[in-house]
């Protein structure tokens, strides 16, 4: 059928609560494309009727809620004018008690389930809630060992739990809970997080190391498409954010309307002592305004930039 197959990492999810997955694969989904979701190689697309428990919502597949029998491989097919990509996502559903955060023994747990706080620092935990715009999320409550978290050291800020002056006693099993509203119905979302405490700050020192770029310029023709990787090494237990910024603004926010320049999905390769992270920036079409502007890759406190430059004229 001419579609290129792309395999995503496994997602491990809780039964009896909402779940959503967005079919984005920059730069494929940046232009004019159609996205269709299928389950287990079925020829019949996932329903787009919003009353259906499982339905497609724009580029998302939405489960309201996820059920035990929903485990399997889902495909989203992205069709552009001249291309077709089929993204395969393996979803594994498991039963989980309301306050149960220790889900050891499950393979390839995402970092959303395992987070790090840094001893003696002000730090934070993140409640990862990825849902389409049609889902409205209420305020988040945080629990530790099944009990609500309280105290002047803890502050809930949007999707984060801020912890001031982290102590060794802050390790343990946490859960964040939110009420999701969709089409007038309410659902509870509960994410478990196993938290460990570290004194170490970074790979080979106190900061993440940006391998590429190296504060340099790149020659690129006007109107072309350009993809630049930012490669970062960091400790396995780091909590650093990696992103691309321009004019001190996230590129996805800066180019929110045109979506001409986008940040890619972060990937990483695990080594024994550290992780190698890659997050790219895609210029769908380089414009004059892009030249001379530093596009910054950030990784924790580390930064490195690229500057686009017009190629020197060829007088041959």
């Amino acid at each position: 059928d001419g579609c290129k197959d792309i395999f995503m990492k496994n997602e491990i999810l809780s039964a009896s609560q909402p779940f959503a997955f967005n079919c984005t694969f920059p730069p494929i989904t940046s232009g004019e494309v159609s996205v269709t979701w299928y389950k287990n190689s079925s020829k019949i697309p996932v329903s787009k009727i919003i009353q259906s428990r499982i339905h497609q919502d724009e580029t998302w597949i939405l489960f309201l809620p996820m059920e035990w029998g929903d485990s399997g491989v889902y495909q989203c097919v992205i069709k552009g004018r001249d291309s077709c990509h089929r993204i395969h996502v393996n979803l594994t559903v498991f039963e989980k008690h309301w306050c149960d955060t220790s889900i050891g023994g499950l393979p390839n747990l995402s970092d959303e389930y395992k987070q790090i706080l840094h001893l003696g620092k002000d730090d934070s935990l993140t409640c990862h809630l990825h849902f389409p715009k049609s889902c409205v999320l209420g305020p988040i409550k945080w629990y530790k060992d099944c009990n609500e978290i309280k105290g002047e050291r803890f502050t809930v800020l949007e999707t984060r739990l801020l912890v001031s002056n982290v102590s060794a006693e802050d390790r343990g099993n946490y859960a964040c809970q939110a009420i999701l509203t969709h089409s007038g119905k309410q659902y509870e979302v509960l994410n478990g997080i196993t938290v460990s405490i570290t004194e170490r700050a970074g790979y080979g020192g106190s900061v993440p190391k940006i391998i590429y770029p190296k504060n340099h310029s790149i020659e690129v023709q006007l109107g072309t498409t350009l993809i630049v990787d930012c490669n970062v090494t960091d400790t396995k237990d780091n909590t650093n954010l990696r992103c691309w910024r321009v004019n001190n603004t996230l590129v996805d926010d800066y180019y929110d309307e045109s979506k001409r320049i986008r940040e890619g999905v972060e990937t990483h390769v695990s080594f024994r002592e550290h992780n190698l992270y890659t997050v790219n920036i895609t210029f769908l079409e380089v414009k004059m305004e892009d030249y001379g502007l530093p596009f910054m890759c950030h990784a924790g406190v580390s930064t490195a930039y690229i500057i686009l430059q017009l190629p020197a004229p060829d007088f041959r």
């Epitope: 989980k96 008690h97 309301w98 306050c99 149960d100 955060t101 220790s102 889900i103 050891g104 530790k144 060992d145 099944c146 009990n147 309280k150 105290g151 002047e152 050291r153 803890f154 002056n165 102590s167 006693e169 390790r171 343990g172 099993n173």
Partner: antibody, heavy 116, light 107 residues
Framework: QVQLVQSGAEVKKPGASVKVSCKVS????????MNWVNQAPGQGLEWMGM????????RLAQKFKGRVTMTVDKSTSTVYMELSSLRSEDTAVYYC?????????WGQGTLVTVSS | DIQMTQSPSSLSASVGDRVTITCRAS??????LNWYQQKPGKAPKRLIY???SLDPGVPSRFSGSRSGTDFTLTISSLQPEDFATYYC?????????FGQGTKVEIK
């Protein structure tokens, strides 16, 4: 390091009250729940209830509602458990146990003897 | 309330033996279960947190596992200092409840 130091042994008459203290050091006192557990001689462990030092929210086991009062003194990082209308079957060792992570640290215990 | 049924109530074993103690929860408690060791005249000491996480300083011969609502504490090779009483505790929802205890004695 973390320490929970309880008050000394008490001998009380039936009908009287006893107030046991638990002084905390080594962690942020107002960040975590504190539990109280008792153990009658030769018997098992029994959860009585818990209090959060931040706002004094208390949760009690049904058996102890009306007879147990838990309080907090933030200035001294101390939690108190008062048991009233004592009877002979209240003779037990009373422990405080912190929920920094669930029931991680325990006091050394306070023996309360109820005898006429 | 959640009931915790612990078995056996006592057992006799020799140094080097493999010992297994079980707690059954009357309803789903996820992994919210601890194991404690108590010696006469002393406060309980936590061995295992959240079903299977070994507390710092606890010998690796102690391990915890779960199958549904059945929880197991295993001592792979009993040592002289392990003769004591062991309790499980569920903290999934209050009122929190302990198992009745298992006394491990020298054969």
């Amino acid at each position: 390091q973390v320490q929970l130091v309880q008050s000394g042994a008490e001998v009380k008459k039936p009908g009287a009250s006893v107030k046991v203290s638990c002084k905390v050091s080594g962690y942020f006192f107002t960040s975590y729940w504190m539990n109280w557990v008792n153990q009658a001689p030769g018997q098992g462990l029994e959860w009585m209830g818990m209090i959060h030092p931040y706002d004094s929210e208390t949760r009690l086991a049904q058996k102890f509602k009306g007879r147990v009062t838990m309080t907090v003194d933030k200035s001294t990082s101390t939690v108190y458990m008062e048991l009233s209308s004592l009877r002979s079957e209240d003779t037990a060792v009373y422990y405080c146990a912190s929920s920094t992570t669930a029931f991680a640290y325990w006091g050394q215990g306070t023996l309360v003897t109820v005898s006429s | 309330d959640i009931q915790m049924t612990q078995s056996p109530s006592s057992l006799s074993a020799s140094v080097g033996d493999r010992v297994t103690i079980t707690c059954r929860a009357s309803q789903d408690i996820g992994n919210a279960l601890n194991w404690y060791q108590q010696k006469p005249g002393k406060a309980p000491k936590r061995l295992i947190y959240a079903t299977s996480s070994l507390d710092p300083g606890v010998p690796s011969r102690f391990s915890g596992s779960r199958s549904g609502t059945d929880f197991t504490l295993t001592i792979s090779s009993l040592q002289p200092e392990d003769f004591a009483t062991y309790y499980c505790l569920q903290y999934a929802s209050s009122p929190y409840t302990f198992g009745q205890g298992t006394k491990v004695e020298i054969k």
